[in-house]
Amino acid sequence: KESCDVQLYIKRQSEHSILAGDPFELECPVKYCANRPHVTWCKLNGTTCVKLEDRQTSWKEEKNISFFILHFEPVLPNDNGSYRCSANFQSNLIESHSTTLYVTDVKSASERPSKDEMASRPWLLYR
């Protein structure tokens, strides 16, 4: 019988460059078997990861994987930093690798990130 754990697929040192003022969706790819786990996002602050409980989140279901999304509408300069998603599964907590957002303030931006850069998802279906 195959093991059936909840799995989080954020790649090591995943990062994204985004522009303040724009909307942005931070995705946590999640694989689960039967019951969808409780997933949360937190932001690293010193030695702790502070839960983002009052932020808008949603699920996007695809064929082989689901995405737990943290919405930034819009991105603010202080959204800069590192985030983790975590899942509770059979009383176990699993936490993803951190993913870092580099926010460029519109006022100081000399040029906008390219379309490709904005669209890229460096953490697709692997860690």
Epitope: V6, E95, S98
Partner: antibody
């Protein structure tokens, strides 16, 4: 239960290549990444690289160009090929499964001894 | 790549006494550190992940601590079956291991 079993011991000449296989059971290669770690006699552990669920790879820069990791999901088998062997490559080669969050290696194979000698 | 410097290289502790192994990262690795135990002739076994979380089935005498660059594995009361080599490993970036600490009974 989760198991990883590497192929048998190999003896190779300098300059040759070796291909070690790792047959897994109890989990699917479409759901977990697999790492390769080696250990020279009496030495520490050295991460060589890994193959992700989608078949893409991440190699230790030390082995870039010399190592190739592949897998066959239908055979539940991962392969690690190391070319241009030298005596310093004499080591036990382990395959190890990623934890579900990818932040440690939770199950290890028994290891394959590869000896490089002229 | 990130260098993990483990100390001491070897350690002899009396049965029932505390054993402490340290690991220092060359740059901050958050809490992306695991500890492994390797007994002679065996493959490594995961003990601790997230720097301080005990893996399933690991006795509670094993404790991990630390964040950033300094990490510690403590065995609160050494048992005969704890004789092994212990390795730390960072997974913040391309994984690297400490050189190992050989733990023996005094």
């Amino acid at each position: 239960q989760v198991q990883l079993k590497e192929s048998g011991a190999e003896v190779k000449k300098p300059g040759a290549s070796v291909k070690v296989s790792c047959k897994v059971s109890g989990f699917s290669l479409t759901g977990y990444g697999v790492n390769w770690v080696r250990q020279a006699p009496g030495q520490g552990l050295e991460w060589m690289g890994m193959i992700w669920i989608d078949g893409s790879t991440d190699y230790n820069s030390k082995f870039q160009g010399r190592v190739t990791m592949t897998k066959d999901n239908s055979k539940s088998t991962v392969y690690m090929e190391l070319s241009s062997l030298r005596s310093e490559d004499t080591a036990v080669y382990y395959c190890a499964r990623d934890r579900p969050d990818g932040r440690a290696m939770d199950y290890w194979g028994q290891g394959t001894m590869v000896t490089v000698s002229s | 790549s990130i260098v993990m410097t483990q100390s001491p290289d070897s350690l002899a502790v009396s049965l029932g006494e505390r054993a402490t192994i340290n690991c220092k990262a060359s740059q901050s690795v958050s809490n992306d550190v695991a500890w492994y135990q390797q007994k002679p002739g065996q493959s490594p076994k995961l003990l601790i992940y997230y720097a301080s979380n005990r893996y399933t089935g690991v006795p509670d005498r094993f404790t991990g601590s630390g964040y950033g660059t300094d990490f510690t594995l403590t065995i609160s009361s050494l048992q005969a079956e704890d004789v092994a080599v212990y390795f730390c490993q960072q997974d913040y970036s391309s994984p690297t291991f400490g050189g190992g600490t050989k733990l023996e009974i005094k």
